[in-house]
């Protein structure tokens, strides 16, 4: 299953499959997730070790048993790959690291006014993988405001150094934010020239293209089909690059197929997995396990559930079958691709779906061992769970926010439905940033069911929580995916990095905002909050957030939207925007419904009709 917990001051001993430099544990975890054999990782922050060569070291590990012995190491951080973690699987990494220089091949230098502009330049450059920016206070005047675009053979820095007034980060191409655009065309009977960066075996050009997309240095590819004249080169997928970023030449060649990486696509990237099943094909590799199952789909599910399994072959040979069940060969290799592909067999083969980010049709939870006033504009994909609840009352308008918590579930505030309980007047927009982008043709979700908490009463602040079941499930993308819920009665976690988002008013007597706003607000203890609201009862099922001096808060139109907090690199839905005295007033914090206190209710209501829990537990 999916394991998300991080282990502080712990280092996994042995099992090394690769090592690299990464700026933090979260990036190390992402590299582990996308490495074909990595199940566990250990990361050494700069503060944890004196050995300069091992600072920022990220160690990717494998284990036949799925675990390794942990040794105590002050400052080290260890954890699990996010394979099998559904929507949490993403190669997108937005963080900017202050006081850190990520080294690599510097291939472009320009003057820019901000680190965000530098990151944008990197994202819009086909070869840029990461960057460093020297701020205006950098010690050498001639380097100030320099934006260095970089790459390396492995896509990660060749070294990371602590350096004042330097900020570094990664390209946002894996976030589907590149302005370059991509070539979707597949070119039949055409071979590209240039430098081969890797060679793998794939059953078709589409798998080859997906592997190219997620390979750090692949810009285009050539695939040799299973009828290519040279037998030893059949099904070979050559991942390629060039200085210019495009093929320098192409040659007409029978039984070859060429194409481009889709990493530069805007708004949609292919999933990092291959779901197609190939009948009459055997995939060769190292044997992991053999099991008898009924049907090729069950074989694929079995492979997906066994975390080390990368691909499988389901044999229909009479000697491999008994009654209705046949042998399912679960296999793996060093690079995640078959070591041999045979055609005209009585088998069917395919890949594990462990890296598919659609996950199951569920709500995401975690286990643990009203515009925003004073906010700023959000960017694409920053809060992919945020939805806009709109009503079509001839004129259409945004009324509330909400949070996507599963393919078919949105969590919001009950008071959003005061006076508007009719489900067919509501339209739910997900994956949007600007309300002005919504036109008559913009797709929206309709409501199948509104589930208001049974103890909620109109005009009272208690139990202000409601679930919306959508008529049709949503697909997950970088711009539309769920937020994880906290564990039941989560009281031990101290959240220090919390944000409220919404399109609500920017002042008490304001108007709905066009661009989704975000504001960083600290949580306030319930005791402190109660002092500020002596006429109301602040219950343990509420959570408050705000600054003593005011100035930053949720406001009208933000209701129902998320209060999210980042903990151990993972965002969780801590609160639902509910009520407050005015907006952003001094010593009047915002009051939010505390989601952890309603986990039993959420779980009960999101049970599917067949009684199967719709919950996904990353831990």
């Amino acid at each position: 299953g999916c394991l998300t917990q991080l282990y502080e001051n712990a280092f996994f001993r042995g099992g090394d499959v690769a090592s690299m430099y990464t700026p933090n544990a979260q990036y190390c975890q992402m590299r582990c997730t996308f490495h074909p054999r990595c199940l566990l990782f250990s990361f050494l922050p700069a503060s944890s070790i004196n050995d300069m060569e091992k600072r920022f070291g990220c160690f990717l590990k494998d284990s036949v048993t799925g675990t390794l012995p942990k040794v105590h190491r002050t400052g080290a951080v260890s954890g699990h790959s996010l394979k099998q973690c559904g929507h949490q699987i993403s190669a997108c990494h937005r963080d900017i690291y202050k006081g850190v220089d990520m080294r690599g091949v510097n291939f472009n230098v320009s003057k820019v006014s901000s680190v965000e502009e530098c990151q944008k330049r990197c994202t819009s450059n086909i070869r840029c993988q990461f960057f460093s920016y020297a701020t205006q206070t950098f010690h050498k005047a001639e380097y100030r405001n320099n934006c260095l675009l970089k790459y390396s053979p492995g896509g990660t820095p060749t070294a990371i150094k602590v350096l004042s007034n330097v900020e570094s980060g990664f390209s946002l191409k894996p976030c589907a934010l590149s302005e370059i655009g991509c070539h979707m065309n597949i070119f039949q009977h055409l071979a590209f020239s240039d430098v081969d960066v890797a060679r793998v075996l794939t059953p078709d050009a589409f798998v080859c293209r997906t592997i190219c997309t997620y390979h750090p240095n692949c810009l285009f590819f050539t695939f040799y089909t299973n009828v290519w004249k040279i037998e030893s080169q059949r099904n070979v997928c050559l991942l390629k690059t060039s200085e210019s970023g495009t093929p320098s030449s192409s040659t007409p060649q029978e039984n070859t197929i060429s194409g481009y990486s889709l990493l530069t696509c805007k708004r949609t990237l292919p999933e990092p997995c291959h779901s197609k099943i190939y009948p009459g094909v055997d995939f060769g590799g190292e044997e992991l396990n053999v099991t008898f199952v009924k049907g090729v789909n069950v074989c694929q599910e079995t492979c997906t559930k066994m975390i080390r399994c990368q691909f499988f072959t389901y044999s229909l040979l009479p000697e491999d079958c008994k009654e209705e069940k046949c042998k399912c060969f679960l296999r793996l290799s060093m690079d995640g691709s078959p070591t041999r592909i045979a055609y005209g067999t009585q088998g069917s083969s395919g890949y594990s779906l462990r890296l598919c980010n659609t996950g199951d049709n569920s709500v995401c939870t975690t286990k643990t061992s009203t515009r925003i006033v004073g906010g700023t504009n959000s960017s694409w994909g920053e809060w992919p769970w945020q939805v806009s609840l709109q009503v079509k009352l001839t004129a259409q308008r945004h009324l509330c926010g909400g949070s996507l918590i599963g393919h078919q579930w949105v969590l919001t505030a009950a008071h959003c439905f005061d006076g508007l309980p009719l489900q067919d007047v509501w339209r739910i927009y997900s994956g949007i940033l600007n309300l002005s982008d919504i036109t008559k043709d913009t797709p929206f979700s309709q409501i199948k069911e509104i589930i208001i908490h049974q103890n909620y009463k109109v005009s009272e602040g208690n139990h202000d929580i409601a679930l919306i079941k959508l008529q049709a499930p949503l697909n997950y993308t970088e711009f539309q995916k769920p937020i994880c819920l906290p564990s039941k009665g989560d009281t031990s976690t101290i959240y220090t990095n919390c944000w409220v988002t919404g399109w609500g008013f920017s002042k008490e007597k304001g108007e709905i905002q066009n661009i989704l706003q975000k504001v960083n607000i600290p949580l306030v203890t319930n005791e402190e909050c109660q002092k500020r609201y002596q006429d109301y009862k602040i219950t343990q099922r509420m959570v408050c957030a705000g600054y003593k001096e005011g100035g930053k808060d949720a406001c009208k139109g933000d209701s129902g939207g998320p209060l999210v907090c980042k903990h151990n690199g993972m965002w969780r839905l801590v609160g639902i925007t509910s009520w407050g005295e005015g907006c952003a007033r001094r010593e009047q914090p915002g009051v939010y419904t505390k989601v952890a206190e309603y986990m039993d209710w959420i779980l009960e209501k999101t049970q599917s009709s067949d009684g199967k829990a719709q919950m996904q537990s990353p831990a």
Partner: antibody, heavy 121, light 107 residues
Framework: QITLKESGPGILQPSQTLSLTCSFS??????????VSWIRQSSGKGLEWLAH???????RYNPSLKSRLTISKDTSRDQVFLKITSVDTADTATYYC?????????????WGQGTLVTVSA | DIKMTQSPSSMSASPGERVTITCKAS??????LSWFQQKSGKFPKTLIY???RLVDGVASRFSGSGSGQDYSLTISSLDYEDMGIYYC?????????FGAGTKLELK
């Protein structure tokens, strides 16, 4: 039970300002989704929608008359008002205030009985 | 503005007869259409909303259908009291616009 009742001056002269009041009961204009429209009916132009006001004070007007129309409300007194400036004989009509079906704006569920306004020199 | 073309402008029918009135919008109105009846000297009475939903208390002989640009009101078995003028109105977008009306008379 939901009722709406229009009141107006009956007769007025060209270039004057027409002031209409809609007094209603059985619902509140502070309820989310609620709204009230003004519609008029004349023998020459048939039925014509004039303006709509929502619970949150959002206002919509017929573009062909927008410069002359002002819709407003007094939520505490359960009243909606319409002002039409610079009237002429073409504004002679029966004026209705209407409320949507149920909670949502779904056609006109409830009509007032109408008030006849005659513009005459 | 969305133009609503209603037909016929007038018609005669006998009690018990099936009567259909149509309304065509100049663009797709997503079923945001209402039908109402007005008897001589009286204020209008809504029959149908959202193209096919019957208002509570309205006789079941009235029904609405249609989608996109084309809509119709059907009276399955005409009654004496059904005489009057029938109008359609679109409320997909402002300004709301009406059909010119269909005058239904007894044969």
């Amino acid at each position: 039970q939901i009722t709406l009742k229009e009141s107006g001056p009956g007769i007025l002269q060209p270039s004057q300002t027409l002031s209409l009041t809609c007094s209603f009961s059985g619902f509140s204009l502070s309820t989310s989704g609620m709204g009230v429209s003004w519609i008029r009916q004349s023998s020459g132009k048939g039925l014509e929608w004039l303006a709509h006001i929502y619970w949150d004070d959002d206002k919509r007007y017929n573009p062909s008359l927008k410069s002359r129309l002002t819709i407003s409300k007094d939520t505490s007194r359960d009243q909606v008002f319409l002002k039409i400036t610079s009237v002429d004989t073409a504004d002679t009509a029966t004026y209705y205030c209407v409320r949507p079906h149920y909670y949502a704006f779904d056609g006109f569920g409830y009509w007032g009985q109408g008030t006849l306004v005659t513009v005459s020199a | 503005d969305i133009k609503m073309t209603q037909s016929p402008s007038s018609m005669s029918a006998s009690p018990g007869e099936r009567v259909t009135i149509t309304c065509k919008a100049s663009q797709d109105i997503n079923s945001y259409l209402s039908w109402f009846q007005q008897k001589s000297g009286k204020f209008p009475k809504t029959l149908i909303y959202r193209a096919n939903r019957l208002v509570d208390g309205v006789a079941s002989r009235f029904s609405g259908s249609g989608s996109g640009q084309d809509y119709s009101l059907t009276i399955s078995s005409l009654d004496y009291e059904d005489m009057g003028i029938y109008y359609c109105v679109q409320y997909d977008e402002f300004p709301l616009t009406f059909g010119a009306g269909t005058k239904l008379e007894l044969k």
